[in-house]
């Protein structure tokens, strides 16, 4: 037999299918020009020493073969002895290691069998009523096709599906969408209405994320507040990467999960902008304010479940940085200015179990005064910090108040509001004999002591009503008792106590009269 012809003799090997798992498959035959034809196939398994034979049976029942050697592609003309206008059955037999392996048969009319392409170029993926919709441009001059898809997940083998007949310039397919795992899809096409025509090759992989992006599993921590009033938010655990099917590993456009960080600054609610969204890779610096941080995962189908973390406020206080002066017109605060043209946010909140909402005020951008201080003033009528109770004050600063990540903490401290000197006056002053020349003076703690760092000291004044001599005794703010010694029996004394802050001298308590009785010996 000539090599260019189909040989109508018995092939040069025994006729027995080994039934092995390897062997030839995916046989495709089609016309490639007016008078030439091509068949190609795949071979699975070791290729060394394998000889391939393309078998053909005509409708008359006569059969022939082409010897392809080690090649998996073979061309022949319409003069090769194979009928091209009538239906023929073709298959491949591969002779290897003393056994024959057979491909599945294809039955077709060669003249009408056109080589169909798989979907080429961009395959658009969208979600439609809980299913996956794929859409692509029909390859040139190939309108009218049957389309199949196959899909797999990281843990499952290929499953075959049907897209149905297509007859337009664009083709589409509805496929199943997995909720929680990524999928790899491939598509193939063949001529519509041409009985037994060959399937095209499979398309390049189309990688599809799960409907729900994976929930981010992250952990945050926050560093100490630095000298600049900012602290770094750090990510302790990166989000886990999505497991991908084999053909999507490496570069897998379409399956990407993006993680975004949504910052919500809870402190200073009077500022212009409370939230900001950032990429997870770019960890921001924060002020000492309280924040909620949401990590939002999203893929091409939209956002998924988020995870929300709370970053408590940094409550480290600076007891001396804030100077408060109370005048007849109102109250003014002074603190070391940060820089030129800074906007400050002053926030105050009543301290204690009843909590109470934080109130704040935003200053216009201001430069430092000649002493390098920034100021904020308010009138008594405004009612700000007007109640006689303890307030926690925080001052934030920013040169760009519209940018959430550029705020810094200037200071945090406590302040006793209202008329602190009067409100702080100690009550329930009592005097008890201690010895022949001394007494113990006790009092109830001043209201100022509920405000950390505000009460500087108590002062106890003792006045000798005879000589009008006065002595004053400073007492630590944590103490509520002092012993007065060197007193004389039979003399009348008055004792008073006051509570002082760093800025204000307190109001004396009501005078308490006492005397040490003269001891009469028998």
């Amino acid at each position: 037999c000539r090599t260019s012809e189909c040989c109508f003799q018995d092939p040069p090997y025994p006729d027995a299918d080994s039934g092995s798992a390897s062997g030839p498959r995916d046989l495709r035959c089609y016309r490639i020009s007016s008078d030439r034809y091509e068949c190609s196939w795949q071979y699975e398994g070791p290729t060394a020493g394998v000889s391939h034979f393309l078998r053909c049976c005509l409708s008359s029942g006569r059969c022939c073969y082409f010897a392809a050697g080690s090649a998996t592609r073979l061309q022949f003309s319409d003069q090769a002895g194979v009928s091209v206008l009538y239906t023929v059955t073709l298959w491949v037999e591969s002779w290897a290691r003393n056994q024959t392996e057979k491909s599945p048969e294809v039955t077709l009319q060669l003249y009408n069998s056109v080589k169909y392409e798989p979907p080429l170029g961009d395959i658009k993926v969208s979600k439609l009523a809980g299913q996956l919709r794929m859409e692509w441009e029909t390859p040139d001059n190939q309108v009218g096709a049957e389309v199949q898809f196959r899909h797999r997940t990281p843990s499952s083998p290929w499953k075959l599906g049907d897209c149905g007949p297509q007859d337009d310039d664009t083709e589409s397919c509805l496929c199943p969408l997995e909720m929680n795992v990524a999928q790899e899809f491939q598509l193939r096409r063949r001529q519509l209405g041409s009985q037994g025509s060959s399937w095209s090759k499979w398309s390049s992989p189309v990688c599809v994320p799960p409907e729900n992006p994976p929930q981010p599993q992250v952990r945050f921590s926050v560093e100490q507040l630095g000298q600049d009033g900012r602290r770094r938010l750090t990510l302790k655990e990166q989000p886990t990467q999505l497991e991908l099917p084999e053909g999507c590993q490496g570069l897998a456009p379409g399956t990407e999960v993006t993680y975004r960080l949504q910052l919500h600054m809870l402190s200073c609610p009077c500022k212009a902008k409370a939230t900001r969204t950032l990429h997870l890779g770019k960890m921001p610096y924060l002020s000492g304010a309280a924040y909620n941080v949401a990590v939002i995962s999203s893929n091409q189908f939209g956002p998924g479940l988020n995870q929300t973390w709370h970053i408590p406020a940094d409550t480290h206080t600076e007891p001396v940085a804030l100077n408060i002066s109370v005048g007849t017109n109102g109250t003014t605060m002074y603190w070391p200015a940060r820089a030129q043209s800074m906007t400050y946010c002053i926030e105050w909140q009543p301290v204690g179990q009843d909590g109470g909402l934080a109130t704040c005020s935003l200053t216009a951008p201001q430069d430092p005064d000649p002493a390098g201080m920034a100021t904020y003033s308010w009138s008594r009528e405004s009612g700000a910090m007007g109640q006689e109770k303890c307030y926690y004050i925080t001052i934030f600063a920013s040169a760009h108040p519209e940018k959430l990540t550029l705020w810094s903490t200037v200071l945090s401290t406590y302040h006793f509001g209202g008329n602190a000197s009067a409100a702080g006056t100690p009550h329930h002053v009592s005097v008890k004999n201690h010895s022949l020349d001394s007494v113990s003076v006790d009092w109830a703690p001043s209201l100022l002591s509920t405000c950390p760092g505000v009460l500087k000291e108590y002062v106890v004044r003792c006045r000798d009503e005879d000589s009008k001599q006065v002595s004053e005794h400073p007492v630590q703010p944590t103490e509520t008792q002092v012993t007065l010694s060197g007193l004389r029996a039979g003399v009348a004394y008055t004792v008073q106590v006051r509570a002082d802050t760093a800025w204000l001298r307190g109001v004396w308590s009501q005078p308490q009269r006492f005397s040490i009785e003269v001891q009469v010996s028998d």
């Epitope: 309280a290 909620n292 995870q307 709370h310 909590g355 109470g356």
Partner: nanobody, 126 residues
Framework: EVQLVESGGGLVQAGGSLRVACAAS????????MAWFRQAPGKEREFVAH????????VYPDSVRGRFTISRDNAKNTVYLQMNSLKPEDTAVYYC???????????????????WGQGTSVTVSS
Amino acid sequence: EVQLVESGGGLVQAGGSLRVACAASGRTFSTYAMAWFRQAPGKEREFVAHILWSGGSTVYPDSVRGRFTISRDNAKNTVYLQMNSLKPEDTAVYYCAQKSGRQVYRIDSWDSFDYWGQGTSVTVSS
């Protein structure tokens, strides 16, 4: 120790409203935040609402935002969950949880909280 007791659950028609309460007792001065979670039969526990004890800032998931409101009465040491426009899928046992201390924590995770109540059952019929 902190003890949490939920109340106010019951049966309600779809579209109706219900208010559940959680009363805290014991070392409540250490409370930093409170939250509500819920668990429907055969499902995982789900975050519903969160409130800071001081200041009252709140967080909700998309599933209840706009329908549920968390609030607190510090003087009574009680946190409330007002549920409006109830749906059959809101049927669950509702638990309140308390957070002490001031460390960084995940708001929507049951494990972040230090104390939990026994739960109150809410059934929404269609």
